[in-house]
């Protein structure tokens, strides 16, 4: 008996061939001997089967002695043995219909679990193997699970169902909902305008939800909500914003926040959360602000940074075109009785300058100039 595998929702064509290459009497029945379709002369007739409105054939093939049974919009319960009766012969075809679906939704938050469930006809014992967009293979029976979804898991998952040495392939598009970056750091000189951007790693037709930016300033004992906003069809509207600092927010995606000026009291870490409509859980992006200030008070030239800096970052003070006068893995450095000239305060990581602030030291009778 010939075995044909089908996919739920798809169309399958079961073949039936006569030795005579011409249109002759034929009919298709199911295992209960209920007529599905056949011909009366050159006209198609349909029987009382439950397939009635989904069963089809192709008239142009009849003249070649081919009498296909086409079943549209396959259902799992269409799995059956189909019998074609032609020229006093019976051809049997076993149709097995499988379905593969993702749990609840194909749009999942980063860190959530993906469960793929195989629907199969009674009596079948299929095996399933799925390959993720990043090439990871998972195998299983009726269910397959992947925990802790990552951004790289977004894309087309290809799953192969094997039964009776036959295979059928499913493609499922999974969208992992996340920000492009889990964390970002912004380095600014005191007084500069700060731009925070939170680009999403996915695109959807309509995006609705609400978000909030909580900020933990280095100098503060507790965190504080800086801004809350709503997102409706990709349009951003601010609900509430603190008076200090007076943040501004862009009206369109990507989410964009502007801090009028970087001040030491704002240096710290923020956590932007985005709750999407009809989704449990939230998207998170961490953002860090490091602020630098260079000052000269009497005979002391000081350079300071505030905010979350890594212990390997180097803070240096040097006179332009000269060797560093002082260089330490600390958040403040100073030089006593600095020479006149343009001094540079540098925050660097393995030789790469992250932040630079210049201060002009005048001869002792003058006051310093900060360009």
């Amino acid at each position: 008996k010939k075995v044909v595998l089908g996919k739920k929702g798809d169309t399958v064509e079961l073949t039936c061939t006569a030795s005579q290459k011409k249109s002759i009497q034929f009919h298709w029945k199911n295992s209960n001997q209920i007529k599905i379709l056949g011909n009366q002369g050159s006209f198609l007739t349909k029987g009382p089967s439950k397939l009635n409105d989904r069963a089809d054939s192709r008239r142009s093939l009849w003249d070649q002695g081919n009498f296909p049974l086409i079943i549209k919009n396959l259902k799992i319960e269409d799995s059956d043995t189909y019998i074609c009766e032609v020229e006093d012969q019976k051809e049997e075809v076993q149709l097995l219909v499988f379905g593969l679906t993702a749990n609840s939704d194909t749009h999942l938050l980063q860190g959530q679990s993906l469960t793929l469930t195989l629907e199969s006809p009674p009596g079948s014992s299929p095996s399933v193997q799925c390959r993720s967009p990043r090439g990871k293979n998972i195998q299983g029976g009726k269910t397959l699970s992947v925990s802790q979804l990552e951004l790289q898991d977004s894309g087309t998952w290809t799953c192969t169902v094997l039964q009776n040495q036959k295979k059928v392939e499913f493609k499922i598009d999974i969208v992992v909902l996340a920000f492009q970056k889990a964390s970002s750091i912004v380095y600014k000189k005191e007084g500069e305008q700060v731009e925070f951007s939170f680009p999403l790693a996915f695109t959807v037709e309509k995006l609705t939800g609400s978000g909030e930016l909580w900020w933990q300033a280095e100098r503060a004992s507790s965190s504080k909500s800086w801004i809350t906003f709503d997102l409706k069809n990709k349009e951003v509207s601010v609900k509430r914003v603190t008076q200090d600092p007076k943040l501004q927010m862009g009206k369109k995606l990507p989410l964009h926040l502007t801090l009028p000026q970087a001040l030491p009291q704002y240096a710290g870490s923020g956590n932007l959360t985005l709750a999407l409509e009809a989704k449990t859980g939230k998207l998170h992006q961490e953002v860090n602000l490091v602020v630098m200030r260079a000052t000269q008070l009497q005979k002391n030239l000081t350079c300071e940074v505030w905010g979350p800096t890594s212990p390997k970052l180097m803070l240096s003070l040097k006179l332009e075109n000269k060797e560093a006068k002082v260089s330490k893995r600390e958040k403040a450095v100073w030089v006593l009785n600095p020479e006149a000239g343009m001094w540079q305060c540098l925050l660097s990581d393995s030789g790469q300058v992250l932040l630079e602030s210049n201060i002009k030291v005048l001869p002792t009778w003058s006051t310093p100039v900060q360009p």
Epitope: Q25, S42, F43, L44, D56, R59, W62
Partner: antibody, heavy 118, light 107 residues
Framework: QVQLVQSGAEVKKPGSSVKVSCKAS????????IHWVRQAPGQGLEWMGM????????TYAQKFQGRVTITADESTSTAYMELSSLRSEDTAVYYC???????????WGQGTLVTVSS | DIQMTQSPSSLSASVGDRVTITCRAS??????LNWYQQKPGKAPKLLIY???TLQSGVPSRFSGSGSGTDFTLTISSLQPEDFATYYC?????????FGQGTKLEIK
Amino acid sequence: QVQLVQSGAEVKKPGSSVKVSCKASGYTFITSYIHWVRQAPGQGLEWMGMINPSGGTTTYAQKFQGRVTITADESTSTAYMELSSLRSEDTAVYYCARDSSGYPIDYWGQGTLVTVSS
Amino acid sequence: DIQMTQSPSSLSASVGDRVTITCRASHHISDFLNWYQQKPGKAPKLLIYAASTLQSGVPSRFSGSGSGTDFTLTISSLQPEDFATYYCQQSYSSPYTFGQGTKLEIK
């Protein structure tokens, strides 16, 4: 060669019945279906029903169900179409036609005009 | 019942013209579509069956195409003997309905 010869024109009163014959020749009668199609004056074609002369299985258009009877006599290679409870709108040319499995309705009779008039 | 709608219902053309008649089914009928030609006082004649298969003896200037619900009959270069009424018929589901016809007249 294949030929389908129909009985002659009929004039009938409303409420009566008419029986039109269709004699086939030039092929094996039981190997093809016979269809009946009618055409009112100046109008299009209307399929009425069909018969498999081998076994006598019939299929009728819902519109004519209960009023039309199609039969076949294998011994004389003749098919019949009887229409009862005639009304004036049944006035038409009635055609028999052969469906040879390979080709749909490839040969037609010459037509029989049935006039229903009081 | 499956309704068959032909367009246009009448058409004026000249010898040598290319003519297209369309037939639309109210439901899917795969390729179970036949085209007939009828001249006044005569029985119809089969031109095309299975949507695109030319009946033997029918000139090759006649061609058919389509599948599902939309079908066309094309006469590539009209000849004087082609002026007649054309009917489509579905053979997919009983009752096997015809279109209302397209009358092709000389311009």
